[in-house]
């Protein structure tokens, strides 16, 4: 059996954060957008993801993981430089691939100690271990020695696809669920709201059936759809009210003439 090293404690456990706001709890604020953000968690001494509502909140909120780490983790830039120069890699870079307990299909990257390179793997969506990066860049920065790494290959952006075994499947028909596509989408210049409100409903990658709402920019209304429990996009709200509050405000009336091809 593949037994994982205990990677639940951060190496920086005893250190104090660099700024007082790094000690604040994650605050999603009163608004109901779903913006992926990062905060420094005082308990785990790591930067972690949370969903920001789009307004108010506090200073312990960052657009990128990197920004959060630089701001709140003492000595992070030094250790990142060390790792990049090949002098020292964090222990978690040597952990074996762990897809985790759950079975969503999420594209992630891990450092492979055999090949000495960062590689793509499919993460199940929960638990697993810290050898698990959202981007190839982040994996390379932290775990790979750039001296030995080949020049970056132009990678196809896979964010709109999921890998299922060796095949690449268009997400609009994952799990035999045909995602409702908006018949008409207003020109982007006619919609001044949040960009994800223009995205089609995406039922996601798992097998649950959860009632959610998405904003249909053609009708200016929020419609119900079945969400499978993981994956998908940000045009995904737990109530119609939240959906309308988040997306309706951006529509400029009487301007929806064209269709985006």
């Amino acid at each position: 059996l593949s037994e994982e090293a205990d990677d639940t404690d951060s190496e920086l456990g005893s250190m104090k954060p660099l700024h007082t706001f790094c000690a604040m709890k994650a605050d999603d604020g009163p608004c109901k957008a779903m913006i992926r953000s990062y905060f420094f968690n005082m308990y785990t001494h790591q930067c972690e993801e949370f969903i920001y509502g789009g307004c108010e909140g506090n200073e312990n909120r960052f657009d990128t993981l990197e920004e959060c780490k630089k701001t709140c983790i003492p000595g992070y830039e030094k250790t990142a430089v060390k790792a990049a120069s090949g002098a020292e890699r964090p222990d978690f870079c040597f952990l074996e691939e762990d897809p985790g307990l759950c079975r969503g299909y999420m594209k992630r990257y891990l450092y492979n100690n055999q090949t000495k390179q960062c590689e793509r793997f499919v993460y199940g969506g929960c638990l697993g271990n810290r050898n698990n990066f959202e981007t190839l860049d982040e994996c390379k920065k932290i775990c790979e020695n750039p001296v030995h790494s080949p020049s970056p290959v132009n990678e196809v952006q896979m964010s709109d696809y999921v890998t299922d075994g060796n095949t690449v499947t268009d997400r609009s028909t994952v799990n035999n669920i045909v995602v409702p596509q908006s018949p008409k989408v207003p020109r982007r210049r006619d919609y001044r709201g949040r960009p994800w409100c223009l995205q089609p409903a995406d039922s996601g990658l798992c097998k649950a059936s959860e009632r959610r709402f998405y904003y249909n920019s053609a009708t200016g209304k929020c419609h119900r759809f079945n969400y499978t429990g993981c994956g998908g996009n940000n045009n995904n709200f737990t109530t119609r009210r939240r959906c309308l509050r988040s997306c309706k405000t951006g529509l400029i009336k009487n301007k929806s003439k064209g269709v985006v091809k």
Epitope: L1, E3, E4, A208, N233, T238
Partner: antibody, heavy 123, light 112 residues
Framework: EVQLQQSGPGLVKPSQTLSLTCAIS??????????WSWIRQSPSRGLEWLGI?????????RYAVSVKSRITINPDTSKNQFSLQLNSVTPEDTAVYYC?????????????WGQGTLVTVSS | DIVMTQSPLSLPVTPGEPASISCRSS???????????LNWYLQKPGQSPQLLIY???NRASGVPDRFSGSGSGTDFTLKISRVEAEDVGVYYC?????????FGQGTKVEIK
């Protein structure tokens, strides 16, 4: 319907090894849409997760730090069951022990539990 | 470890009346797209626990619609819209954001 049937002794002497087995029907121990866990319950500790095993092209296990040096959870694919071994037990390990299935596809939770086995550690 | 704290620890209820149980986690349990890494279980007297609510707000198979889960971040609530006699037992919340998986200390619901 998934059923988990526990077996093993209810009385173990201090410093000995606690051994329990959980027989699975209605699912496979090597299913890639499940994980198999042991959880115990005592008045002092409440529900305490001990460890889990799961198969995703190969076997994985994770254990609670509190018992990590003493615990082993193993699958037995030929009998479609999994077992718990807890070494060097003390009276503190007295509890009701449950095996449980973690549903990896839909629920993402412990959706099936064994009947529970009260294990008393006493000389 | 993520600490799960439930309140109240004991909840006397009247059949037909609503009931509410709170669960607070020591760190955020919300993942992207609104997935909440939190489950609720009910352990009826003399029985093993059973899954009630998964991913924060979704009822498990066979669970009556009088049960609902809500909350985000670190604060979660289990509500019973109209308590029935068969709902007595101990209710537990459980997180699976990180290892070790941890449970709340339980809320005992009993009929007044």
């Amino acid at each position: 319907e998934v059923q988990l049937q526990q077996s093993g002794p209810g009385l173990v002497k201090p410093s000995q090894t606690l051994s329990l087995t959980c027989a699975i029907s209605g699912d496979s121990v090597s299913s890639d849409s499940a994980a198999w866990s042991w959880i115990r319950q005592s008045p002092s500790r409440g529900l305490e997760w001990l460890g889990i095993i799961y198969y995703r092209s190969k076997w994985y296990n994770r254990y609670a730090v509190s018992v990590k040096s003493r615990i082993t959870i193993n699958p037995d694919t030929s009998k479609n069951q999994f077992s718990l071994q807890l070494n060097s037990v003390t009276p503190e390990d007295t509890a009701v022990y449950y095996c449980a299935r973690w549903h990896s596809d839909k629920h993402w939770g412990f959706d099936d539990w064994g009947q529970g086995t009260l294990v008393t550690v006493s000389s | 470890d993520i600490v799960m704290t439930q309140s109240p620890l004991s909840l006397p209820v009247t059949p037909g009346e609503p009931a509410s149980i709170s669960c607070r986690s020591s760190q955020s349990l919300v993942f992207r797209f609104g997935i909440t890494y939190l489950n609720w279980y009910l352990q009826k007297p003399g029985q093993s626990p059973q899954l009630l609510i998964y991913k924060g707000s979704n009822r498990a198979s066979g669970v009556p619609d009088r049960f609902s889960g809500s909350g985000s971040g670190t604060d979660f609530t289990l509500k019973i819209s109209r308590v029935e006699a068969e709902d007595v037992g101990v209710y537990y919340c459980q997180q699976y954001t990180s290892y070790p998986l941890t449970f709340g200390q339980g809320t005992k619901v009993e009929i007044k």
